[in-house]
């Protein structure tokens, strides 16, 4: 209806004596802003005066001033939208109807709100889910139709009077739609919570009790059972009787069926709360429990372990591990079904009793080949001694033992011979399947464990073989001791350290790298001529004539070896210089004369100097001095000087005679 003011607020607000009430409220006036506001308690319309009668709790004046006695009631609204109110503290006699008398310039309205104030704090309300099952998380909700900014409260959960310290989530609502405080508790109830009292306690800011609501938990759960057995220790001998009784300590809802299980399997035709076992056999040993079901599901009791005692059965031996590797540890386990467990054991190795071995396990920390064989045992308990079973075989595996490399050839072995070796061993488990040789070579193995070396090398010093099964065992290497002629024979100059100059003392050494046998002889030769039989060839004062090609030979009983030819070079200053003339020492003027400086030098002459009869050096430095045309004045004695890196040499004088030509004579 467009002729109405529009208000939104909770229909009824709840509080208690001494608390407060907060009234969320919104409105929309028909026209303009609010000019006057009066809050009535239980207003009644007076037709005579056309006004409302009742207690005025709050009154706003045009100037907006509020009388001091109205401090308890506060209008927190505004002139066009908000009509929120607060009463603090609220009293019991505030209960009833609050009338909000609103006036604008032209319109008036009375809005009614119910206020319910109780003498004591009213209780919250617990809401439970329709069904609660054990171990399934549920949310418990506690709702209180109260919230006020000026009066802090809290909702606390208790279980059997003790605070529950699971995390509860508290929320408050102070809206035009609803005013409440709510606490939600997530909780996983156990069967033992069935029938327990849960309390939601309303508390003041100091945690003190104001009011509460309680509920009794109805936790649906499978039957909870207790099993009792006679005899109580559940230990009997074959032929005895046993009684088991199943008691239901709790079930919600009531149980419907009963059954018994042995080792997890249902026992046929056993559907009562008592299980009677008469004249038990050892096969009836095992774990027994009773199972009782209700609509939630089956519940099982704890297991009772029934032990039917009997003497040990024939024993078997378990070996950890066979085959065993020599040096490893091995454990033997004597297995014999018996109840009670055997207290004593007797062990046998190859039928012979093993002294001092009375335990269920025999541990050998380091297995040796002689430990191989058949192991058996006998178990004994308070009811008797068992029989010896068939036993178990221990296979001890080990690498080939005492491996040797044997040379089949007659000794000594010479370079180039064919050598045959064999690889021998004493024992092996498992059998030898292959052989290895060191060093590796392109050698033949004509049969397993035999090696043939064709054309044996001088440097084949040692050979070792390995015999292999799952492991390889290496023999100590054997020396072939191959004999050979001296090797790497070469000439080495010992002195001088630098180049050889004429007149030096010179020593040459005949070197070789190896020889077998070691006893050797030396020979020196030059140009096919034997010079000496020592390892060294010595020259006290070397001359250029000693230069040439030298070789040395070294021989032993196997053969002889020559060095490469070694060239001995002797350096000397120019010598035997002479001047030769061409065409001769007498030349006619006008012709050509060539003077040549001839010499013997090592290294060759690098520089020539020419001199005339006055010992004047001429401006010519080559080996030949060419005079063309030759003049009579050129007649005279000439000599030359040659220089190399070692020194200088000079020639004797050679005379050149230049005679007049017939023309010159004719002119005279």
């Amino acid at each position: 209806d467009s002729s109405k003011w529009v208000f939104e607020h909770p229909e009824t607000l709840y509080a208690w004596e001494g608390a407060c009430v907060w009234i969320p409220c919104t409105y929309r006036a028909l026209d303009g802003d609010l000019e006057s506001f009066i809050l009535f308690h239980n207003p009644e319309y007076n037709k005579n005066t056309s006004k409302f009668d009742g207690t005025r709790l709050y009154e706003s004046t045009k100037d907006g001033k509020v009388p001091s006695e109205q401090k308890r009631v506060q209008f927190l609204g505004d002139k066009n939208k908000n009509c929120t109110l607060s009463i603090h503290p609220v009293h019991l006699n505030d209960s009833g109807q609050l009338g909000l008398r609103m006036e604008s310039k032209t319109e008036k309205w009375m809005e009614r709100i119910h206020l319910n104030v109780s003498e004591r704090p009213f209780p919250p309300h617990i809401q439970l889910p329709p069904e609660i099952q054990e171990s399934q998380e549920v949310t418990l909700t506690c709702l209180l139709n109260f919230s006020c900014y000026g009066y802090p409260i809290q909702l606390q959960w208790l279980l059997e009077g003790v605070p529950m310290r699971q995390a509860a989530v508290t929320s408050t609502s102070l809206t035009i739609k609803s005013v409440f405080t709510r606490s939600e508790l997530k909780f996983s109830p156990q069967w033992s919570h069935h029938g327990k009292i849960v309390t939601c306690q309303l508390q003041d800011a100091d945690g003190k009790f104001l009011s509460n609501d309680t509920v009794q938990l109805n936790v649906k759960h499978t039957p909870k059972l207790e099993i009792k057995v006679t005899p109580s220790d559940a230990i009997v001998r074959e032929g005895d009787s046993v009684t088991m009784t199943c008691e239901v300590s709790s079930s919600n809802p009531e149980y419907t069926t009963v059954s018994w299980l042995k080792d997890g399997t249902s026992l046929k035709k056993q559907n009562t709360f008592t299980l009677n076992l008469r004249e038990v056999t050892k096969d009836q040993s095992g774990k027994y429990c009773c199972q009782v079901s209700n609509d939630v599901g089956p519940g099982r009791s704890e297991e009772v372990f029934l032990q039917v005692q009997y003497a040990p059965e024939p024993s078997t031996v378990q070996i950890l591990h066979s085959p065993a590797v020599e040096g490893s540890q091995v454990e033997f386990l004597c297995m014999s079904l018996a109840n009670p467990l055997p207290t004593n054991y007797t062990w046998y190795h190859n039928g012979k009793e093993m002294q001092g071995r009375t335990e269920e396990k025999v541990h050998i920390p380091k297995i040796l080949p002689w430990h191989a064989g058949t192991y058996s045992c006998v178990a004994e308990n308070i009811l008797g001694t068992g029989q010896r079973g068939p036993g178990a075989e221990l296979d001890v595996q080990y690498p080939p033992k005492k491996v040797t490399t044997v040379i089949q050839n007659p000794m000594p072995i010479r370079e180039g011979d064919t050598v045959t070796l064999s690889c021998n061993y004493n024992s092996s488990n498992p059998s030898v399947t292959r052989y290895e040789w060191k060093p590796h070579g392109a050698w033949e193995e004509p049969s397993l464990g035999v090696l043939k070396i064709q054309n044996v090398g001088w440097d084949n010093t040692t050979i070792a073989c390995a015999a292999c099964n799952s492991w390889c065992s290496w023999a100590s290497p054997v020396a072939l001791n191959v004999q050979y002629a001296p090797r790497d024979v070469r000439v080495r100059k010992i002195k001088p350290l630098s180049e050889i100059h004429s007149g030096n003392s010179v020593s040459l050494q005949c070197d070789f790298s190896s020889s077998h046998p070691k006893e050797v002889q030396f020979f020196w030769e030059k140009n096919g001529r034997l010079l000496g039989k020592e390892s060294q060839l010595n020259f006290d004062s070397i001359s250029p004539e000693d230069a040439g090609s030298y070789s040395c030979w070294v021989n032993n009983s196997i053969g002889q070896t020559a060095s490469k030819a070694w060239t001995l070079e002797v350096l000397y200053a120019p010598r035997r210089l002479r001047v030769s003339m061409s065409p001769g020492d007498q030349v006619m003027e006008g012709k050509s004369a060539t003077l040549t400086c001839e010499s013997d030098a090592n290294p060759p002459v690098s520089h020539y100097t020419w001199f005339d009869w006055n010992n004047q050096s001429l401006p010519y430095h080559s080996q030949k001095l060419r005079l063309e045309p030759v003049k009579v004045q050129h007649s005279g004695a000439y000599w030359c000087q040659g220089t190399n890196s070692v020194g200088k040499g000079r020639s004797p004088l050679s005379t050149l005679t230049v005679y007049y030509s017939p023309e010159t004579i004719g002119r005279r």
Partner: antibody, heavy 119, light 112 residues
Framework: QVQLQQPGAELVKPGASVKLSCKTS????????MQWVKQRPGRGLEWIGR????????HYNENFTTKVTLTVDETSNTAYMHLSGLTSEDSAVYYC????????????WGQGTSVTVSS | DVVLTQTPLSLPVSLGDQASISCRSS???????????LHWYLQKPGQSPKLLIY???NRFSGVPDRFSGSGSGTDFTLKISRVEAEDLGAYFC?????????FGGGTKLEIK
């Protein structure tokens, strides 16, 4: 049995701070609010404030709001009171006490820590 | 804050005598829930206070029955029917109805 253990004494310089501990045993720490009380010779007992060990929520006596901070360590079941800006007026014995959740009474008290503020 | 006034300040007694201590509150200690949170403690020299009586008249566990509490609203009394040597010390009343909690000034029970 319920026990609240406090160190015997603390000597502090003026202006400094001190953190007093109260180690509990023999009960579920988070269920009971922990209260702290001050006692000066000839001045009686003064309630300082309380803490809920479960939520950490605190409430202080207005006379102590700027002086005191209450905390707890759930893992070690220990409550702490931090006193700052110490003066000679803060020299006193400080007790921690457990508040019962049904009758709101301080049912078990620690032996108290004597704090002396002196340069 | 609620003020608790204890009288007398000092109470000299002979062993075997009855003793009575009064505690007056500046305002009612009845909580909105109807309970009255007025308690009594005994503090022996060098020790912490020990709870004797809670919520006016309930004896704490292990407290002998010679101790009794009574009162309502603003006036409360602690009585010791036959004083024994171990009862000597300072007695305090305390309220936990209003926050902050407050304590009386104490009454020293001593041998005459």
């Amino acid at each position: 049995q319920v026990q609240l253990q406090q160190p015997g004494a603390e000597l502090v310089k003026p202006g400094a701070s001190v953190k007093l501990s109260c180690k509990t045993s023999g009960y579920t720490f988070t269920i009971y609010w922990m209260q702290w009380v001050k006692q000066r010779p000839g001045r009686g007992l003064e309630w300082i404030g309380r803490i809920d060990p479960h939520s950490g929520d605190t409430h202080y006596n207005e006379n102590f709001t700027t002086k005191v901070t209450l905390t707890v360590d759930e893992t070690s079941n220990t409550a702490y009171m931090h006193l700052s800006g110490l003066t000679s007026e803060d020299s006193a014995v400080y007790y921690c006490a457990r508040r019962d959740y049904s009758y709101y009474v301080l049912d078990y008290w620690g032996q108290g820590t004597s704090v002396t503020v002196s340069s | 804050d609620v003020v608790l006034t204890q009288t007398p300040l000092s109470l000299p007694v002979s062993l075997g005598d009855q003793a009575s201590i009064s505690c007056r509150s500046s305002q009612s200690l009845v909580h909105i829930n109807g309970d009255t949170y007025l308690h009594w403690y005994l503090q022996k020299p060098g020790q912490s206070p020990k709870l004797l009586i809670y919520t006016v008249f309930n004896r704490f566990s292990g407290v002998p029955d010679r101790f009794s509490g009574s009162g309502s609203g603003t006036d409360f009394t602690l009585k010791i029917s036959r004083v024994e040597a171990e009862d000597l010390g300072a007695y305090f009343c305390s309220q936990s109805t209003h926050v902050p909690y407050t304590f009386g000034g104490g009454t020293k029970l001593e041998i005459k």
